[in-house]
């Protein structure tokens, strides 16, 4: 186990896991709304308001290289940004019948910890990634993916499950985080915002990206998800940020072009198999890694998160299609389906590359670098 083993908490109520409420613009809280007491930012989260720049203080960020066509996270300006002003507590909903995690939604009642107590745990996801504070771990080797290039047949299920669009993956997609850390891919899904509003789950220095892809994996040490939940390293998620670029992304178009068929909550369609690895960044060697949780109920902890440093580019039209096609519960648009960032509570994010060195305009400032925890791995 590369990351420190973090014991599953037995939280005593309280503790909110705020998600963004996908309300109409007119329902959004005003900027002066006070933060919710149940969800105080961790020390590593938001700074005092006097330190916050306005939007105009953020320099424009250009991709590092023309041929790569995608932004590198360490190229982002090192600025402290507030959480989105529209981040009230995100709650889950259960039908009268359901005393389980099978029925929940973004926004509404009751709070997620009442649906699943683990949602109030101390080591939750997503988190804000601060490259300057990440621990460089040379032991973190390039990710290995095998069998991700699927033939057109058999087809795969693409489903609108009411809180995301999910592609169910067949057996045989193998992924290794390193020697002896082997997984098989189960499904992938996306998180997004709304028109003019970004919707990634993880953030970088407070910067939220337009969207985020998650590929969920089960450790080969476990037979089933139910048995892996809450076990350190039982599940692993590969995450990548989606950004706006000048060209259409042909890999994503194979999925986005089918969204109209599954606009209704609970609907599904079959799509030809595709190259799943083409939905991810090309650079498997540069990434951030930490131990967190599922970002939706049951919020089980022990999940190994690997967040790519390189982003994936989609056209503006594609990002609009993603955020403006699907419908969720209660005749509401399926938008802003992301959870608010959660406090690190002492966790250290590791980087497979020296992310905190010469990577931003503020690199000259004295920074307390964390040490790598993967020694001897």
């Amino acid at each position: 186990q590369r990351l420190p083993r973090m014991q599953e908490d037995s939280p005593l109520g309280g503790g909110s896991s705020g998600e963004d409420d996908p309300l109409g613009e007119e329902d959004l809280p005003s900027e002066e709304d006070s933060p919710r007491e149940e969800d105080p930012p961790g020390e590593e989260d938001l700074p005092g308001e006097e330190d916050l720049p306005g939007e105009e203080d953020l320099p424009e960020v250009k991709p590092k290289s023309e041929e790569e066509g995608s932004l590198k996270l360490e190229d982002l300006p090192t600025v402290e940004a507030p959480g989105d002003p529209q981040e009230p507590q995100n709650n889950a909903h259960r039908d009268k019948e359901g005393d389980d995690q099978s029925h929940w939604r973004y926004g509404g009642d009751p709070p997620w910890p009442r649906v699943s107590p683990a949602c109030a745990g101390r080591f939750q996801s997503p988190v804000d990634i601060r490259p300057q504070l990440a621990a460089f771990c040379p032991a973190l080797r390039p990710l290995e993916l095998l069998g991700f290039q699927l033939p057109p047949l058999p087809e795969l299920r693409l489903r609108n499950n009411g809180h995301s669009v999910q592609l169910t993956l067949p057996p045989g997609l193998e992924m290794a985080l390193g020697p002896g850390r082997e997984y098989r891919a189960l499904q992938l899904h996306l998180h997004w915002g709304a028109a003019g509003r970004p919707g990634s789950e993880h953030t970088v220095e407070g910067h939220r990206f337009p969207a985020e892809i998650h590929v969920v994996h089960l450790s080969t040490a476990f037979a089933r998800v139910d048995e892996a939940l809450g076990r350190p390293g039982g599940l692993a998620v590969l995450a990548a940020f989606l950004e706006e670029g000048p060209e259409e992304n042909s890999a994503y178009e194979q999925l986005l072009s089918r969204l109209e068929e599954i606009a209704e909550e609970g609907s599904e369609t079959q799509v030809p198999g595709l190259d799943i690895s083409a939905l991810l960044p090309s650079d498997f060697s540069r990434y951030f890694q930490y131990e967190g949780s599922l970002t939706t109920p049951p919020c089980a902890q022990g999940v190994i998160w690997t967040v790519f440093n390189q982003t994936v580019m989609l056209s503006a039209k594609q990002l609009h299609t993603l955020s403006d096609t699907l419908w969720g519960p209660g005749d509401s648009r399926l938008q802003l389906n992301f959870r608010a960032t959660q406090p690190l509570n002492g966790r250290v994010i590791e980087a497979s590359f020296p992310a905190g060195v010469d990577s931003s305009p503020r690199a000259a400032e004295p920074v307390q670098l964390n040490s790598c925890l993967a020694a001897g791995d």
Partner: antibody, heavy 126, light 111 residues
């Protein structure tokens, strides 16, 4: 005790309909993937239909368009509506449950079914 | 569609013998394979899940192995009560029609 009990079988004419029920006790079936399996007299087991915990339903080619699997979580029951019945549908029909809670939102697949019901005989004959 | 090819279709062995039954999937199913024992007039009983894990209450003389497309059920020392028909079930997908299939069965008789 965790148990599944099928009912609803009987004699029906070709082209007729029948609805099988599978009542669960000792557990709530709402979070499980469930399956119908049949066995023609003297033959092997044949997968008929499956329903995941999101109530998405799938079928064997031999019954697609004629059979419908459904569940009623409030009644803790699984159903198989069989229409346009043929002589070759004559079999003992079993329901069975995925051995652990299903997380189909996470792409979970069943790797074994337990428990099974005792079976109910469907005879299609004129 | 997935197909499961099971062999042999029948076998006869003596008490104490080691018995091996194989199952081959038409495409990789990782370890989503289970083995069942069925006696006449009874419902199937789960023996092995996830290709190699012993179900609760099943004697340790039963074991399973394999991954991908080739799987084996072994009875290390055949007992009288093991006379039954054995089936494998492979699951490739539950999100497509015909994503699961049983093998044709192996009838085990005691000499």
């Amino acid at each position: 005790e965790v148990q599944l009990v099928e009912s609803g079988g009987g004699l029906v004419q070709p082209g007729g309909s029948l609805r099988l029920s599978c009542a669960a006790s000792g557990f709530s079936l709402s979070r499980y993937t469930l399956i119908w399996v049949r066995q023609a007299p003297g033959k092997g087991l044949e997968w008929v239909s499956i329903i995941d915990s999101s109530s998405s339903a799938y079928y064997a080619d031999s019954v697609k368009g004629r059979f419908t699997i459904s569940r009623d979580n409030a009644k803790n029951s699984l159903y198989l509506q069989m229409n346009s019945l043929r002589a070759e549908d004559t079999a003992v029909y079993y329901c069975a449950r995925d051995r652990v809670l299903s997380y189909d939102d996470y792409g979970d697949l069943p790797d074994g079914f337990d428990p099974w019901g005792q079976g109910t005989l469907v005879t299609v004959s004129s | 569609d997935i197909q499961m090819t099971q062999s042999p279709s029948s076998l006869s062995a003596s008490v104490g013998d080691r018995v091996t039954i194989t199952c081959q999937a038409s495409q990789s199913i990782s370890n989503y394979l289970s083995w069942y024992q069925q006696k006449p007039g009874k419902a199937p009983k789960l023996l092995i899940y996830a290709a190699s894990k012993l179900a609760s209450g099943v004697p340790s003389r039963f074991s399973g192995s394999g991954s991908g497309t080739d799987f084996t059920l072994t009875i290390s020392s055949l007992q009288c009560e093991d006379a039954a028909t054995y089936y494998c079930l492979g699951v490739y997908s539950i999100s497509t029609d015909d994503g699961a299939a049983f093998g044709g069965g192996t009838k085990v008789e005691i000499k």
